[in-house]
C-alpha cells in the first residue's frame, strides 16, 4: 500500500463561452468501488470547494443538479468540465480524489490546473 498520485494539466484556457475541460487521472493503490472527486479552487491561501461527486467504479459521475461541473469517468480517469466561468474565476483548480470504499481510505490531490478565463468582448452596436 502506498500514497495515491493524481495528475492534471498545468494550464487550460476556457472557451469564449466560459467552459473549461480537463482530465484528472489517478493511480489507484487500492481496489476501490466508490470514489469521490472534488474540484477545489485555490486563491491566495484560501481553498474553496467548487463541486464534488461520488461515483461507483464503472458507473457515471453524477454532480448535483445545480453544480457548475459535469464529468465522465473511465477507469482511473475523470474528464471534468466547469461551466459558467468568467474572467474573475481565473485561478488554480485542484483535483482531489478520495477512494472511499472499501477501507482503507486513500487521498490524492493534484498540483492544480491554472484555468484562464477571458470575458468575450461585447458585440459592437450596429448603426442601421
Amino acid at each position: 500500500c502506498k500514497a495515491m498520485h493524481v495528475a492534471q494539466p498545468a494550464v487550460v484556457l476556457a472557451s469564449s463561452r466560459g467552459i473549461a475541460s480537463f482530465v484528472c487521472e489517478y493511480a489507484s493503490p487500492g481496489k476501490a468501488t466508490e470514489v469521490r472527486v472534488t474540484v477545489l479552487r485555490q486563491a491566495d491561501s484560501q481553498v474553496t470547494e467548487v463541486c464534488a461527486a461520488t461515483y461507483m467504479m464503472g458507473n457515471e459521475l453524477t454532480f448535483l443538479d445545480d453544480s457548475i461541473c459535469t464529468g465522465t469517468s473511465s477507469g482511473n480517469q475523470v474528464n471534468l468540465t466547469i461551466q459558467g466561468l468568467r474572467a474573475m474565476d481565473t485561478g488554480l483548480y485542484i483535483c482531489k480524489v478520495e477512494l472511499m470504499y472499501p477501507p482503507p481510505y486513500y487521498l490524492g490531490i493534484g498540483n492544480g490546473t491554472q484555468i484562464y478565463v477571458i470575458d468575450p468582448e461585447p458585440c459592437p452596436d450596429s448603426d442601421f
Epitope: C1, K2, A3, M4, H5, P29, E34, R36, T38, L40, V47, T48, E49, A52, T54, K96, E98, M100, Y101, P103, P104, Y105, Y106, L107, G108, I109
Partner: antibody, heavy 118, light 107 residues
Framework: QVQLVESGGGVVEPGRSLRLSCAAS????????MHWVRQAPGKGLEWVAV????????DYADSAKGRFTISRDNSKNTLYLQMNSLRAEDTAVYYC???????????WGQGTLVTVSS | EIVLTQSPGTLSLSPGERATLSCRAS??????LAWYQQKPGQAPRPLIY???SRATGIPDRFSGSGSGTDFTLTISRLEPEDFAVYYC?????????FGPGTKVDIK
C-alpha cells in the same frame, strides 16, 4: 468562525459504555469528514475513527474496531462516538477534528476527558 | 499501517536559536504530511500541511521540507511561545498516523 465543542466525557467503570458528542458550527458540517483523535495522559496523539460525507463511510483504528462506533447527525451538526466495553487503556482526552478540504486536520475541539477506572 | 518516527525526542534550545525536527515514515507518504503544535492543556494546532504549506495564521519562521519518507520542520528563530510538543502526521491513507512527538523545551 469554525467551532468544535466536545462533551460527554467523565469517569466510567471498566466494561461500561459512554457516548461522546461534538457540536460543530461555523461551516457546512455535511461537506466535511470528521475525526476522533485521543491522547492518553502524558502520551502522544492517536487517531481513533473517521466518518466521511455519507454516514455509511467510516473507518476505525484497530484499537477501536468492534467496540467504538462513530456516527453523525448532519441535521444537528453533531458528531458522536459511542464507546462500549471500555478499558483502562481507553483513558484519554478525546478530540474531534475536521478533515479540511486539503486533507489535514484543520480545526480541533478543546477535548473531553474520559477516565476508565474502578 | 504507516509508522512515523520523530527525532529527537526532546530538543533543548534557547530563544532565538534554530530548531530542526525530523520525521521519518516507514513508507512513502508523498506530500500528505502535516505538522501540529501542542501546548500543555491545549488542543493540537496545525502548522504545516502538504509538507511545506503553512496553515492559516502561522508565522513564516515555521517551514517544512522533505519528500517521500524523510521530512523536516524548521523553526528559524525560536520565540518563547514556540516551546511545545510537535507532532508529524500522515493523512494520505487510513489508518491516519501520528509520530510520537518532539518536545522543544527551554535550555
Amino acid at each position: 468562525q469554525v467551532q468544535l465543542v466536545e462533551s460527554g466525557g467523565g469517569v466510567v467503570e471498566p466494561g461500561r459504555s459512554l457516548r461522546l458528542s461534538c457540536a460543530a458550527s461555523g461551516f457546512t458540517f455535511s461537506s466535511y469528514g470528521m475525526h476522533w483523535v485521543r491522547q492518553a495522559p502524558g502520551k502522544g496523539l492517536e487517531w481513533v475513527a473517521v466518518i466521511w460525507y455519507k454516514t455509511s463511510e467510516k473507518d476505525y483504528a484497530d484499537s477501536a474496531k468492534g467496540r467504538f462506533t462513530i456516527s453523525r447527525d448532519n441535521s444537528k451538526n453533531t458528531l458522536y462516538l459511542q464507546m462500549n466495553s471500555l478499558r483502562a487503556e481507553d483513558t484519554a482526552v478525546y478530540y474531534c477534528a475536521r478533515a479540511g478540504l486539503l486533507g489535514y486536520f484543520d480545526y480541533w475541539g478543546q477535548g473531553t476527558l474520559v477516565t476508565v477506572s474502578s | 499501517e504507516i509508522v512515523l518516527t520523530q527525532s529527537p525526542g526532546t530538543l533543548s534550545l534557547s530563544p532565538g536559536e534554530r530548531a530542526t525536527l525530523s520525521c521519518r515514515a516507514s513508507q512513502s507518504v508523498t506530500s500528505y504530511l502535516a505538522w501540529y503544535q501542542q501546548k500543555p492543556g491545549q488542543a493540537p494546532r496545525p502548522l504545516i500541511y502538504g509538507v511545506s504549506s503553512r496553515a492559516t495564521g502561522i508565522p513564516d519562521r515555521f517551514s517544512g521540507s522533505g519528500s517521500g519518507t524523510d521530512f523536516t520542520l524548521t523553526i528559524s528563530r525560536l520565540e518563547p511561545e514556540d516551546f511545545a510538543v510537535y507532532y508529524c502526521q500522515q493523512y494520505g491513507m487510513s489508518p491516519f498516523t501520528f509520530g510520537p512527538g518532539t518536545k522543544v523545551d527551554i535550555k
